[in-house]
């Protein structure tokens, strides 16, 4: 089982849309795939895919999940808020027929505020 995640870095404006993609591949077929998205180590959602369908369509605040055969799991954040900034990781595990698991690399999401002055103040507030 292999998982490829993208993009590595994503910078979007507050109120717009962010799309994170996870490509899940396995040489042999699987009956049930458990997937998980985390943000800064905290679980956003942990649905499974079976018979070509996701058991859950929502994933965290303003997050929508979709599965496009053969291998694309998409997390769409819309609208994006400042709280969405963080490090996202996609994880997958084949539960049936045999346990296999893998995870993607981090996607770092940066959300710019609508007000550019707010952005300047935020950057200036970092120490040192």
């Amino acid at each position: 089982l292999s998982v490829q995640q993208g993009p590595n870095l994503l910078q979007v404006r507050q109120g717009s849309q962010a799309t994170l993609v996870c490509q899940v591949d396995q040489a042999t077929a699987w009956e049930r795939l458990r997937v998980k998205w985390t943000k800064d180590g905290a679980i956003l959602c942990q649905p499974y895919i079976t018979n070509g369908s996701l058991s859950l369509g929502v994933c965290g605040p303003q997050g929508r999940l979709s599965w496009q055969a053969p291998s694309h799991l998409t997390l769409q954040l819309d609208p994006v808020s400042l709280n969405h900034s963080g490090a996202y990781v996609c994880w997958a595990a084949v539960e049936i027929p045999e346990l296999e698991e893998a995870e993607g690399n981090i996607t770092r999401l940066f959300v710019d505020p609508d007000d550019p002055t707010q952005n300047r103040n935020r950057i200036a507030s970092f120490p040192g």
Epitope: L1, S2, D25, A27, T28, A29, A69, P70
Partner: antibody, heavy 120, light 113 residues
């Protein structure tokens, strides 16, 4: 250009262990998402999957041979190996190494094959 | 284990004529999760190792002549050669990768009449 090359003795005595090595060039066997495989073909017959080892080191064997097979990897030499114990004349075959990727599921590159004869 | 049954075992063909090889699996090779058939076709020319022709039942590998085509879904698959050429001689194998153990058909030997 990815190339695979089998090497090992062409003659093995019954009850002994058959040992073959596959040297991979043009590609690192530590690359994620690949299965390094062994397949054999009895003279004038079809193909039989022996097993493979995944990038993670996990092995998968054909149940018909599982008790006698070991597949391992030597990353420092970019090689993977097959050991088949307690051989009999029925193990006489051309042995191929090949690779398979998660993003496919087919055997993309094959070695040229090496004939191993089991005879005293 | 999934049993792959190929017919015919031998196929004599006149150059320029079409050829068809059938492959049947003992269980479905179609996944509703990935919408794929886990079935490949290989050609093994005399004295050579097998080479992939078709993957996922119907996708031709880049560089494979378009006279080769694959079709079918579930348990019944077909490899067709629209106009056989002398260089097409060899053994054709189907292979399933739906599950382990991976299994091959017994092969079809294509020969020129």
């Amino acid at each position: 250009q990815v190339q695979l090359q089998e090497s090992g003795p062409g003659l093995v005595k019954p009850s002994q262990t058959l040992s073959l090595t596959c040297t991979v060039s043009g590609f690192s066997i530590t690359t994620g998402g690949y299965y390094w495989s062994w397949i054999r073909q009895h003279p004038g017959k079809g193909l039989e999957w022996i097993g493979y080892i995944y990038t993670s080191g996990r092995t998968y064997y054909n149940p018909s041979l599982k008790s006698r097979v070991t597949i391992s990897v030597d990353t420092s030499k970019n090689q993977f190996s097959l050991k088949l114990s307690s051989v009999t004349a029925a193990d006489t075959a051309v042995y191929y190494c090949a690779d398979m990727a998660d993003k496919g599921g087919w055997f993309a590159y094959w070695g040229q094959g090496t004939l191993v004869t089991v005879s005293s | 284990d999934i049993v792959m049954t190929q017919t015919p075992l031998s196929l004599p063909v006149t150059p320029g004529e079409p050829a068809s090889i059938s492959c049947r699996s003992s269980q479905s090779l179609f996944s509703s999760n990935t919408k794929r058939n886990y079935l490949n076709w290989y050609l093994q020319k005399p004295g050579q190792s097998p080479k992939l022709l078709i993957y996922h039942a119907s996708t031709r590998l880049s560089g494979v002549p378009d006279r080769f085509s694959g079709s079918g879904s579930g348990t019944d698959f077909t490899l067709k050669i629209s106009r056989v050429e002398a260089e097409d001689v060899g053994d054709y194998f189907c292979q399933q990768h739906y599950e382990t153990p991976l299994t091959f058909g017994d092969g079809t030997r294509l020969e020129i009449k």
